[in-house]
């Protein structure tokens, strides 16, 4: 039974490689998937000596290890690329690294949008 799942319809979108891949650089992504399959949002990034380099954000296809995650939290210790996924619209707006070995929790907030 899939109790209490947060339905994901839209995610924050970002692609650092947008020029080469001929996509938008950032925005919102409407998630599309097969009927009866769950959808998630994800974020991926690099951490070079404390400098966060966002790689990609967007929709993520049905992945069991993303089920029931309300927040985007990466737990791998020191990967080349950090990854997190979550359920719920725009849940990938902010993302966190919480290493399993009990290091400091680091949360990355999106920069505030410039006033129009």
């Amino acid at each position: 039974s899939g109790r209490g799942e947060a339905e994901t319809r839209e995610c924050i979108y970002y692609n650092a490689n947008w020029e080469l891949e001929r996509t938008n650089q950032s925005g919102l992504e409407r998630c599309e998937g097969e009927q009866d399959k769950r959808l998630h949002c994800y974020a991926s990034w690099r951490n070079s000596s404390g400098t966060i380099e966002l790689v990609k954000k967007g929709c993520w296809l049905d992945d069991f290890n993303c089920y029931d995650r309300q927040e985007c939290v990466a737990t791998e210790e020191n990967p080349q690329v950090y990854f997190c996924c979550c359920e719920g619209n725009f849940c990938n707006e902010r993302f966190t690294h919480l290493p399993e070995a009990g290091g400091p929790e680091v949360t990355y907030e999106p920069p505030p949008t410039a006033p129009t």
Epitope: S1, R3, E34, F64, N65, Y67, D68, T75
Partner: antibody
């Protein structure tokens, strides 16, 4: 080092019950989904059940629905499989497995044997 | 009911190349099923070889590779060795919390 240690297997009569446990160590148990997979003697692997990180979503193969219940205690780093109304065809080695992103089984326990026989 | 099919048995000469496949009765296997492959020797727990179609698990030699061939997932072993003689299982994640294992392929390394 990731370790998964199953226990609770044994001989049980048809219609009986057993509760399997899987003690996890070497990783933060609450951060990963988990699953049970079984293997009947001389047969192939068969997925049995899966449970999400919080325990809020549980899933079963058709042949065990209504008889088996998967659960987890994140404070005890333990996965459970409650097996009721056991049948001879449930005889198998039961493995617990850790599920990682892209829905694969990245670590396996050594298994515990369940024998259902009169 | 989804059935995942594998060749029941396969033989390969030492140093040879073998490709095991994994299909299913409901259409084509694609990367969205996150195909993964496991090796099992008698009396042992399975060992994870390949996940997410083509990513090798930690410590798996690069003689093992995964791909999509036509409408099936595939596991290729190049330069087969005697200790590759095992059972090999593919798994497809069908989504909605459901996995289906293939029936397994018994690989014999001749000689």
């Amino acid at each position: 080092e990731v370790q998964l240690l199953e226990s609770g297997g044994g001989l049980v009569q048809p219609g009986g019950s057993l509760r399997l446990s899987c003690a996890a160590s070497g990783f933060t148990f609450r951060n990963d989904a988990m699953s049970w997979v079984r293997q009947a003697p001389g047969k192939g692997l068969e997925w049995v059940s899966g449970i999400s990180v919080t325990g809020g979503s549980t899933f079963y193969t058709d042949s065990v629905k209504g008889r088996f219940t998967v659960s987890r205690d994140n404070s005890r780093n333990t996965l459970y499989l409650q097996m009721n109304s056991l049948r001879a065809e449930d005889t198998a080695v039961y493995y617990c497995a850790k599920v990682y992103y892209t829905s694969f089984f990245d670590y396996w326990g050594q298994g515990t044997l369940v024998t259902v026989s009169s | 009911q989804t059935v995942v099919t594998q060749e029941p048995s396969f033989s390969v000469s030492p140093g040879g190349t073998v490709t095991l496949t994994c299909g299913f009765n409901s259409g084509s296997v694609s990367t969205s099923y996150y195909p993964s492959w496991y090796q099992q020797t008698p009396g042992q727990a399975p060992r994870t070889l390949i996940y997410n179609t083509n990513t090798r698990s930690s410590g798996v030699p690069d003689r093992f590779s995964g791909s999509i061939l036509g409408n099936k997932a595939a596991l290729t072993i190049t330069g087969a060795q005697a200790d590759d003689e095992s059972d090999y299982y593919c798994v497809l994640y069908m989504g909605s919390g459901i996995w289906v294992f293939g029936g397994g392929t018994k690989l014999t390394v001749l000689g």
